[in-house]
């Protein structure tokens, strides 16, 4: 008799999930020698323990606490780049500007980036068929709770000037419902963070508007100011040129506004 299995609205666990997490962990420790002594099998065991045998709509931040004990990786607190709805460019930027870090440049972020996972209540199985969708099923699912937890800790660790890359092509440049808007903004520590500097990335070549005057950016400024953190905003009119100038800052064309 086939066992009844809960059908969720979202895609199932990424295929070869355990192997992928383990392989990413090993690769990360090879790329980052300061993590050379991390035991990736123990990392996987803690990751697995957060969601295996648990109802995938009843996951809490507490479930991830054993894994978060590894999250003491020291990223320079004044070199943090947050992003919202513009992940690829943010990652391209930190690949060039090696002394700046997005969440996905840390071990835990690197392990989980673009992956989906969930288990089933009372069985040790990983569910490869379907996982809860944040909107249609539940918000307390393994993936959402993981990102909420690591994002909160990442924001809490930030200091001095924190940068955030925002997508100027979206109707809501700053979205209060994004991870940045709902978690990271509210967990920046005013006693440590002096300024949040937003980089608004323009999409169109001929788009010369000052998107820093956008109502949603003004909303962000208001939220940040109320938290006793200064706010500044820059338009990045030409993201391609922006990246090029990060690579080659001496280039004569890099003195003009980008």
């Amino acid at each position: 008799v086939p066992r009844w299995r809960q059908q969720w609205s979202g895609p199932g666990t990424t295929k070869r999930f355990p192997e992928t997490v383990l392989a990413r962990c090993v690769k990360y420790t090879e790329i980052h020698p300061e993590m050379r002594h991390v035991d990736c099998q123990s990392v996987w065991d803690a990751f697995k323990g957060a969601f295996i045998s648990k109802h995938p709509c009843n996951i809490t931040e507490e479930d991830y606490q054993p894994l978060m004990k590894l999250g003491t990786q020291t990223v320079p607190c004044n070199k943090i780049l947050l992003w919202s709805r513009i992940k690829d460019l943010a990652h391209q930027f930190t690949q060039v500007q090696r002394d700046m870090f997005t969440l996905e440049d840390t071990l835990l972020g690197y392990l989980a980036d673009d992956l989906t996972w969930c288990g089933e209540f009372n069985t040790s199985k990983i569910n490869y068929q379907s996982c809860p969708d944040w909107r249609k099923d539940c918000s307390n699912n393994p993936v959402s709770v993981f990102w909420k937890t690591v994002s909160r800790r990442f924001a809490e660790a930030a200091c001095d000037v924190v940068h955030v890359m925002l997508n100027g092509s979206r109707s809501k440049i700053f979205d209060k419902n994004s991870t940045f808007g709902s978690v990271e903004v509210h967990n920046l520590q005013p006693e440590k963070v002096q300024t949040l500097e937003a980089w608004v990335i323009h999409g169109g070549r001929e788009d010369s508007r000052d998107l820093c005057q956008d109502p949603t950016i003004k909303e962000l400024e208001s939220i940040i100011s109320k938290r006793n953190i200064q706010f500044s905003c820059k338009n990045i009119y030409r993201p391609d040129k922006f990246l090029q100038c990060v690579k080659n800052p001496e280039d004569s064309s890099c003195t003009s506004e980008i």
Epitope: P33, E34, R36, H37, D39, S42, K69, T72, Q73
Partner: antibody
């Protein structure tokens, strides 16, 4: 074969300074993390400091932070430990060790004795 | 600073099996590799086990390492007189940003 030879130990008064050296051979020195580990008389091993390869990052035990400085000269295949504000409890045999990629100390020198006494 | 906890001594007769425990926390053993070193007085310490259970070439297979959670252990089977030495476990510790050693275990062959 891999050889690590420490030198620079000796008798020094409390508050004094000493500089230990470690001459390395038999491996590509610039590729590896290097460390100092000590053993006080009748006590166990205690990690003191490490220095990374590449653009050096340094790591120190709480007991020596602010007083000791680890450094390296890749051109000379040498590791150093500058010890200032020495205390009686710093009396120990100091070993230089080569760290492998998994973090283990694969090769050790024979050690040099530092005695801090008035 | 708190290191890793080892029993001060262990003993066995020739040919016996001896196990040495090493306990720590999630900030050291929990998420990091465990290493074991053998130290004979007057000589340089020698790496015995790395990455929890790996033996460097030249180390006899009588020595084996294991790890579970926040604890690790070293087993010496077929104990021999030349195994009389001090044994130390070690691991990186995140909270200290450095290595921690165990207090050491003196193994005596009776």
């Amino acid at each position: 074969q891999v050889q690590l030879v420490e030198s620079g130990g000796g008798l020094v008064k409390p508050g004094g300074s000493l500089r230990l050296s470690c001459a390395a051979s038999g491996f590509t020195f610039s590729d590896d993390y290097m460390s100092w580990i000590r053993q006080a008389p009748g006590k166990g091993l205690e990690w003191v400091a490490s220095v990374s390869n590449g653009r050096p990052t340094t790591y120190y035990a709480d007991s020596v932070r602010g007083r000791f400085t680890i450094s390296r000269d890749n051109a000379k295949n040498s590791l150093y430990l500058q010890m200032n504000s020495l205390r009686a409890e710093d009396t120990a045999v100091y070993y230089c060790a080569r760290e492998a990629w998994g973090g283990e100390f694969t090769n050790w020198g024979q050690g040099t004795l530092v005695t801090v006494s008035s | 600073q708190a290191g890793l906890t080892q029993p001060p001594s262990a003993s066995g007769t020739s040919g016996q099996r001896v196990t040495i425990s090493c306990s720590g926390s999630s900030s050291n053993i929990g998420f990091h590799f465990v290493y074991w070193y053998q130290h004979l007085p007057g000589t340089a310490p020698k790496l015995l086990i790395y990455k929890n259970n790996q033996r460097p070439s030249g180390v006899p297979d009588r020595f084996s390492g294991s790890k579970s959670g926040n604890s690790a252990s070293l087993a010496i089977s077929g104990l021999r007189s030349e195994d009389e030495a001090d044994y130390y476990c070690a691991a990186w510790d995140d909270s200290l940003s450095g290595y921690v050693f165990g207090s050491g275990t003196k193994v005596t062959v009776l």
